[in-house]
Structures are given as C-alpha cells and as structure tokens.
C-alpha cells in the first residue's frame, strides 16, 4: 500500500509471523508507531511496535502464535494498519487488505550440512523452517556456491524446481574452501518473494591423491 511517499510492505512466513516494513519520507524518527493486524474472520488481533531500521523506515514482526502453528489460512484477509501517536491520539498512516498467502516470504532454510564430500563434488542437505504443510511439494529453491576470489553476487544461481532439500555440487576444485547458501520460495502467491539466504555453510573439498590423474 503506497500513499504519496509512504510505503507499507508486509510478508507472511506461512505459519505464525507477518513481517512489515513501513517507510515514509519526512517522518519524525522519534514518533511512536505500531502495526495493527485485524483478521476478517478470527477472534484475535495483534500489534507490534515499529522500530527504526534506517533514516526513514521502520520494521516489526507480528507474532501470531507459536512458530509452527497455522494461524492463517488461504482464505483469510487481514487488515493491516500503521498507527502513529500524535499527542494523545493515534493517527492512521497506512492501511492495506493483506492476503497472507499472496504475500509469502518463508524463513531461510536451516540445518545445512555436508552429507558427503570428495575431491570434485560435495553433497549438501538442508531443511525448511516454519513452512506450512499447505505447500505439499510445491516449493522451489535457489542455491549458490562461493568460490575463492569471487563474491556472492558473482556466484551463478542454481535452480531446483521442486521440493528437493539437497544438492550435489559437481566440478569443484580439489582441496579448496567453498561456501554454500540456499533460499526457498513457494509457487503460491502473486507477490511472493524469495526467503532470505541461509547462513553460509563452509566446506572444503578433499585433496587429490598424489600421483593420480585427476
């Protein structure tokens, strides 16, 4: 939802968290603001305090329940409002009718581990975190490997077009230090975006055997 120079963007993690960012040019840094969430068909509502993340933007997380509880469904619509205190009263600064499963951003994959490593290849697995059972197998992943002397931005993206929580990296250089990251995205949702990248997993390929043709 955009009002003039105001921007209010929220994502649902598919389970029990809505994360929001509100930015407004010229807003006072010390103003007290909140996000209010009112689902259309549920008995609860939720509030979080917006905290500054930069000169003109604030963020907060609406915690709807325990991390793995399914607090919203595919048919819920949540009215989200930014409310800022002006003296003794609250003023509404932004509002949107939020369809949670059209605005998804899952948590970063976790538990990355090396399953098997050789001289030229490495098998890595991971787990998805706090993802709804709604998605069944309809998720996709992107992965990238950081090679020596390169940046993450230069790393080519590998796409896994199905729910596959492992990858076999090939054509690696022996006895070399690498880092690996992965992110996840459901197919569902018009405004759905990629999760954050996972924490990098560092690994080293095995050295080539001496005197062997590799």
């Amino acid at each position: 939802a955009v009002n003039g120079t105001s921007r209010f963007t929220c994502f649902y993690n598919s389970r029990a968290n809505i994360s929001c960012v509100w930015s407004q040019d010229g807003a006072l840094q010390d103003t007290s603001c909140q996000v209010h969430a009112w689902p259309d068909r549920r008995r609860w509502n939720q509030t979080c305090e917006l905290l500054p993340v930069s000169q003109a933007s604030w963020a907060c997380n609406l915690i709807l329940g325990t991390p793995d509880s399914q607090k919203l469904t595919a048919v819920d619509i949540v009215t989200l409002r930014v409310m800022c205190r002006e003296g003794v009263r609250w003023r509404m600064m932004a509002i949107q009718d939020f369809k949670p499963f059209e605005n998804l951003r899952l948590m970063a994959p976790i538990s990355l581990q090396v399953v098997h490593v050789e001289t030229h290849r490495c098998n890595i697995s991971w787990k998805i975190s706090q993802a709804s059972h709604y998605f069944e197998r309809h998720l996709e992943f992107e992965a990238r490997t950081l090679s020596p002397g390169h940046t993450w931005e230069e790393a080519p993206l590998m796409t896994l077009k199905q729910k596959q929580e492992w990858i076999c990296l090939e054509t690696l250089t022996p006895d070399t230090q690498y880092e690996f990251q992965v992110r996840v995205k459901p197919l569902q949702g018009e405004f759905t975006t990629w999760s954050p990248w996972s924490q990098p997993l560092a690994f080293r390929t095995k050295p080539a055997a001496l005197g062997k043709d590799t």
Epitope: T73, A74, V75, Y134, F135, E136
Partner: antibody, heavy 117, light 107 residues
Framework: EVQLVQSGAEVKKPGATVKISCKVS????????IHWVQQAPGKGLEWMGW????????EYAPGFQDRVTITADTSTDTAYMELSSLRSEDTAVYYC??????????WGQGTTVTVSS | EIVMTQSPATLSVSPGERATLSCRAS??????LHWYQQKPGQAPRLLII???QSISGIPARFSGSRSGTEFTLTISSLQSEDFAVYFC?????????FGQGTKLEIK
Amino acid sequence: EVQLVQSGAEVKKPGATVKISCKVSGFNFKDSLIHWVQQAPGKGLEWMGWIDSENGETEYAPGFQDRVTITADTSTDTAYMELSSLRSEDTAVYYCARGGPWFLSYWGQGTTVTVSS
Amino acid sequence: EIVMTQSPATLSVSPGERATLSCRASQIISNNLHWYQQKPGQAPRLLIIYGLQSISGIPARFSGSRSGTEFTLTISSLQSEDFAVYFCQQSNNWPWTFGQGTKLEIK
C-alpha cells in the same frame, strides 16, 4: 502410493442425512488437507469445503455451509463428509481429495448419492 | 463468486493435431488457475497449476499460458488417451470455482 478410498453408493430420501467416508493411505494424514467436491449432473464441479487434519480447522463454501460437516479421525486416517437436509438436487457424485488449499492433487474414486422419494 | 467460463463447450480434433482450450475468469485472478482432466467414470486428474506449472508425471505435450484473465491449455499433439473433459479452477477468491468443462472429442 497415495490412495483415497471412499465408501459405497447411497440412496437417500429427501430431508435425510448422508455421511460418506474417505480412508487415506500413502501419505501423512496428520499434515494434510482433505477436501470434498460435488459433481452434480446439471451443475458441474462444486467445492464444498476442506478440513486441515493438522489442527481440525474446517472451511466451508457458502453454498454448503449450513448443511455440510467435515470431520477427520486421525486414529484411522479417515475423513468424513456429512450432508443434511438432502434434496433431489443433491443427487451427485461426491469426491474427497487431497491437496493444499488451492488445488486438488489426488482424488478418491467418488461416491454416488441418489436422493429420491 | 468468480465465474469461470470455458470455451468451446466441445472441441473436435484429430489425433496428432494441436488442441487449444480456453478459460476466462470474470475478474482478475492473478495466476491462481489450475487445470484438470476427467475421463468418463473417473475422478478428475490435476494437470497444470498456477496457470503454467506442469505437475510431475504429466506428459510434456500439456502446457498452460495466461493473458490477463484468459488462460489457455494447449495439448501439442493429441494422443488417443487425451480425449476427455477438461476443467479449469480458480483459487483466488473463496469459494474456489470450476469452469463448466470443455469436452475434447475425436474428429
């Protein structure tokens, strides 16, 4: 192999109630959604609603809300659909199906319900 | 509720030829459109999700596309087992609704 096996055909009188079962296998029933769809001769396919076996939550389509009850027994991996106050236009094939909320990945074989006086 | 209109109601095509089936939504549904195939006496079978994503195990000759509120299912080279009824279904606004179906018959 994913399977949904439904109970047999039913013949009911107007005003009666029918209860159809759907026994599932080949997947984890406790983190699945089981849906029910009606296919009536003149009306095509109509979504009736679903149950989330993880938490027991149900969602009913407005056109069926007053008359349908969907339940699940996680001890037997079986879902049930009960339709009350039957009328002749409820004569149809009823399907259970598994899927996320948005589409139906696997279907039962269907149960024919005939409502006739 | 959203009305899904499929055209034509019946389509006659020869085996080996291309078939193009259309589905139009009464309002914008983003890419929340799914396609099913149903043969006589059988339950429907899911073919395509989100307008164009094919389901694993479905032959590559089935493909989907979207232009605004109009969605198309294309079968590139018809096989004998493809003659059936095809339904579209939207999942943008509850209750999800189906089209009335297109019957694909042998010419």
